[in-house]
């Protein structure tokens, strides 16, 4: 069972003193963020118990296996049902504190009961209040049953429940009809899933036998010991004032473990601590009485004496629990009360004896679950005593359960039981994620779910060259970090496979699942510079570059061109596709905007060194376009061109760029700049005859604006072949821009 | 299904007596008070007598206490009511029903009926 | 024992009217007051418990209301499938007792 412990606090004469403390004795327990244990939950169950709403609790965590809640301002907040949840996976356990109000109406006489399935369970309520109303049993919060206030039996109101099932488990309380439901006696029922002496799927194993006041659990056969006792089957006492599975916990105060609640895994439920009982576990045992809630008789014989936390303290040469054994009966000494072996493992166990007769090696035997009995392959005699040792054949997993040392000789006999948990090795259920990738190493997570049984103690990362048939390489990891694996061949698939392990000899699990990973290529190692560049309009930039001349092939897939625009704070990314190119065209750029550009090499997802970067302005945009262009024939080799000046202008405009081309031609237009922007007509000459041209221009201030519409014109007659158009403004001759 | 089934009605002479089952299915029985209320012909309700889910306590209406006995066989899941000295005015369709509780509101209800069963006291 | 009074003891309405019943205890019974509806041939069946809880399935139209010796049962729009008798039960002490009802036929 998991060793998780909660405490209450029942000094309740001030409710702001009052306080619920849950101890968790697991390894790790706790640690919240760490894969390997969820933290430990302490809260008030209000979904049965429903109180008024007052402050929230304060909760704080002592450490990482203790959490304490307080804030409790008024008796009703302590009222209800409280529970603590710890231990991790499939060992998660919740442990439940049901709080009575001591002023209620109706008080439980003993609030958990825990009884076997088929038994009769007998809830019984006392009147401390009395109401000469109904008194209303609920189960779980709903209606259960009903009896007269007549019904009292010695001031009692009794709830029998016959042949109990586990669904019949929960919170049961009485009520009387009309009264606050914070006077009611709340019980906590909990009906082990076998009959009394039984455990497992089918109840079909028998319980080792607790001592003490321990409850098997009917779902692995353990005893739960009461707080103060430990050992497998609760055979041994702790000191006074210590609690937890190997009486590691201390009570706190100085009054020891007086006016605490201890609640642990059910089917054990909640008692006073050892040496304790009463309503608020403020009495001391009476005489001859001790144990959890004082429910146990000493008895003891041959001049023992009953202490109140442990039990008969015997005289020199008598031992047993009533002091019953004679010293010269053999008995078994200092056997561990739980062995943990790994499946498959062959074990050496040793059982020491003592006694008169001296026991020898034929008198010690080893019983296993099924009843096979193991005789000793050798023994160690000295003075007092003999340690008999047995090898144990390869365990299956039906080997875990009580196993048994067995000595006997003539003044006697003597057993003590011992659990047995064979665990299964780790294996691990999927392969190792893969986190990042260089040319020469890969970073692998080697955290992955796992059958079998934990802890993990070690995690290897087997890794080699995909279909190759040399040695695996391996690499010894902690479970919990991230692993380089270094030194490997660039652009190469590599298996990789990772085997768990789990503490003790044959804890090596079988090797998970492989899964493939490849190394990035070679990282390009040339630099590029850059030649030149020139704008070609406000958005656009050519730009080119070289690469240093080496020998061999090319270690590149292509380019990537990096604008920064440090204003804006953006950065233009362009792909060169091709390792042959060495000039780029740079569109949808920012008119107005200082970049800085630089281009460096790619080859797979790896980046080269970059080039020196260049800094380039781009001009600004430019004005609109100018409205109503209009064009007239005027012979067989002139047009005449008409505008308005653009609306709006940000500035004075430099000049007028004319565009000319023929119309379905296919050669590049003709660029003509109108040097005098003042003038809203121009002349084009020296165009062919006959011929049908498109027309379209743009104003200039810094940067060259947006274009006008185009306008369709044919020039004239037959006449001969010009030269080319050239542009007269008012009979000044302007040279052709191309 | 949850339901209440009333019998052993029928017609009695004056001073005679008769026994009234009430058979219930669908629901733990032996948790529940139970009651019988009568109503005779063109009249209102009268509730008659209760008894508490145990057996162990009874209640009855002063014009039957004394001639009337209602009782309980949690483990046939049937409730009776035992009439003697049978008089005119006991004829009535006699209900049994189950009195409930909420279990936020904490008031008694009747919340299930059986459909009845007639006694007619005649000479 | 505890005397209940329904009035009046019987009305008439038409669908979509809304109607109320009324019903006066002889001594202080708090909320513990109940309503059963029924009709000839039938059973009661629970309407309204404690006051002013709707069982389970009954149409909202149905409510209660009141305290202490003075309650009211309203139908806030008469349907044709609601006319019937209306009776009263306190559950505030034994014996339970009834009111003589209230017939609601139609107009």
């Known amino acids: 069972a998991v060793d998780l412990t909660l405490l209450a606090n029942l000094r309740l004469t001030d409710p702001q003193r009052f306080f619920l403390t849950c101890v968790s004795g697991e390894a790790g327990a706790g640690r919240g963020s760490d894969a390997w244990g969820p933290p430990l939950l302490l809260e008030k169950d209000d979904r049965i118990v429903r109180t008024p709403p007052g402050p929230p609790l304060r909760l704080a965590r002592n450490g990482s296996h203790q959490v304490t809640l307080r804030g409790f301002s008024k008796p009703s907040d302590l009222v209800g049902v409280f529970s603590c949840v710890g231990g991790a996976g499939a060992r998660r356990t919740r442990v439940i504190y049901v709080h009575n109000s001591p002023g209620a109406h109706l008080l439980p006489d003993k609030v958990t009961h825990t009884v076997n399935k088929g038994d009769t369970a007998v809830l019984s309520a006392r009147v401390h209040k009395e109401k000469q109303t109904d008194v209303i049993w609920k189960s779980n919060g709903s209606y259960f049953y009903t009896l007269d206030w007549h019904e009292a039996q010695d001031g009692r109101f009794l709830l029998q429940l016959p042949n109990v099932q586990p669904p019949s488990s929960g919170i049961y309380s009485a009520t009387y009809l009309e009264a606050s439901p914070l006077g009611s006696a709340f019980f906590r029922l909990i009906v082990r899933g076998c009959g009394a002496g039984r455990w497992g799927p089918g109840c079909t194993k028998e319980c080792p036998g607790c001592l003490h006041g321990g409850v098997c659990h009917d779902h692995d056969g353990e005893c739960v010991c009461p707080p103060g006792f430990t050992g497998t089957r609760c055979e041994q006492a702790c000191r006074e004032g210590r609690f937890g599975q190997s009486c590691q916990e201390q009570c706190p105060g100085i009054s020891g473990c007086r006016g605490l609640t201890f609640c642990l895994p059910d089917p054990y439920g909640c008692s006073c601590g050892s040496g304790w009982r009463g309503s608020q576990c403020q009495e001391a045992c009476a005489p001859g009485h001790f144990g959890a809630d004082c429910r146990l008789q000493c008895q003891c014989q041959n001049g023992g004496t009953c202490d109140r936390f442990s039990g008969c303290v015997c005289p020199s040469g008598w031992h047993g629990v009533h002091c019953e054994k004679s010293d010269r009966i053999p008995q078994i000494l200092n056997m561990a009360s739980e062995l943990e072996f790994n499946l498959e493992t062959m074990p050496r166990i040793n059982c020491a004896a003592a006694g008169n007769p001296f026991p020898v090696r034929g008198s010690i035997e080893l019983r296993k679950p099924d009843g096979t009995v193991l005789l000793s392959t050798k023994a160690i005699v000295e003075p007092e005593k003999t340690t008999a040792e047995f090898e144990v054949p390869r365990l299956v997993l039906a080997d875990s359960g009580f196993w048994e040392c067995r000595v006997s000789t003539s003044g006697g006999q003597d057993s003590r039981r011992f659990k047995v948990n064979v665990k299964v090795p780790p294996v691990p259920l999927a392969a190792p994620r893969l986190l990042t990738k260089q040319s020469r190493q890969l970073v692998v997570s080697p955290l992955v779910s796992f059958s079998g049984d934990g802890p993990i103690s070690t995690v290897r990362l087997h890794y080699r060259p995909q279909d190759s048939t040399m040695d695996w390489s391996t690499i010894v990891v902690d479970p919990s970090e991230n692993v380089t694996l270094m030194n490997l061949r660039p652009k190469t698939g590599y298996s990789v496979r990772v085997q768990l392990s789990r503490p003790g000899e044959g804890g090596e699990g079988a090797w998970g699942p492989p899964t493939l990973m490849t190394t990035d290529c070679p990282e390009p190692l040339l630099q590029p510079w850059l030649e030149g560049w020139h704008v070609e309009g406000t958005d656009r930039l050519r730009v080119s570059w070289s690469l240093p001349l080496v020998p061999g092939p090319l270690v590149g897939d292509g380019f990537l061109l990096r604008l920064w625009d440090g204003t804006r704070g953006q950065e233009r990314r362009e792909n060169v596709s091709s390792p042959q190119a060495r000039t780029a065209l740079l569109t949808g750029l920012t008119p107005g905007t200082h970049y800085q550009l630089d281009v460096q090499l790619y080859h797979c997802t790896l980046l080269g060194p970059a080039s020196p970067p260049a800094h380039v302005l781009l001009p600004p945009s430019g004005p609109p376009a100018p409205r109503h262009l209009h064009a007239q024939a005027l012979s067989d080799s002139e047009i005449q061109l008409t505008w308005k000046h653009p609306e709006a202008l940000p500035g004075p405009i430099s000049k007028y760029v004319v565009e000319v081309q023929v119309a379905g031609g296919a050669g590049d237009p003709l660029w003509i700049d109108v040097d005098r922007p003042e003038e809203t007509s121009t002349i084009i000459r020296g165009l062919n005859a006959s011929t049908r041209y498109l027309f379209r221009m743009r104003a200039s201030i810094q940067g060259l604006g947006d274009w006008s519409n185009t306008v369709e014109e044919s020039t004239l007659g037959n006449g001969l072949q010009a030269e080319g158009p050239v542009q007269e403004s008012r009979a000044a001759e302007e040279g052709l821009d191309q | 299904e949850v339901q209440l089934l009333e019998s052993g009605g029928g017609l009695v002479q004056p001073g005679g007596s008769l026994r009234l089952s009430c058979a219930a299915s669908g629901f733990t029985f032996s948790h529940y008070k139970m009651v019988w209320v009568r109503q005779a012909p063109g009249k209102g309700l009268e509730w008659v007598s209760v008894?508490?889910?145990?057996?162990?306590?009874?209640r009855y209406a002063d014009s039957v206490k004394g001639r009337f006995t209602i009782s309980r066989d949690n483990s046939k899941n049937t409730l009776y009511l035992q009439m003697n000295s049978l008089r005119a005015e006991d004829t009535a369709v006699y209900y049994c029903?189950?009195?409930?509780?909420?279990?936020?509101?904490?008031?008694?209800?009747?919340?299930?009926w059986g459909r009845g069963t007639l006694v007619t006291v005649s000479s | 024992d505890i005397q209940m009074t329904q009035s009046p003891s019987s009305l008439s309405a038409s669908v979509g009217d809304r109607v109320t019943i009324t019903c006066r205890a002889s001594q202080n019974i708090n909320i513990y007051l109940n309503w059963y509806q029924q009709k000839p041939g039938r059973a009661p069946s629970l309407l309204i418990y404690?006051?002013?809880n709707l069982r389970s399935g009954v149409p909202s139209r149905f409510s209660g209301s009141g305290y202490g010796t003075d309650f009211t049962l309203t139908i806030s729009g008469l349907q044709p499938e609601d006319f019937a008798t209306y009776y009263c039960q306190q559950s505030h002490s034994a014996p339970r007792t009834f009111g003589q009802g209230t017939r609601v036929e139609i107009k």
């Open positions: 008894i508490y889910p145990s057996g162990g306590w009874t």
């Open positions: 404690t006051q002013s």
């Open positions: 029903a189950r009195e409930m509780i909420d279990t936020i509101s904490p008031g008694w209800h009747f919340d299930l």
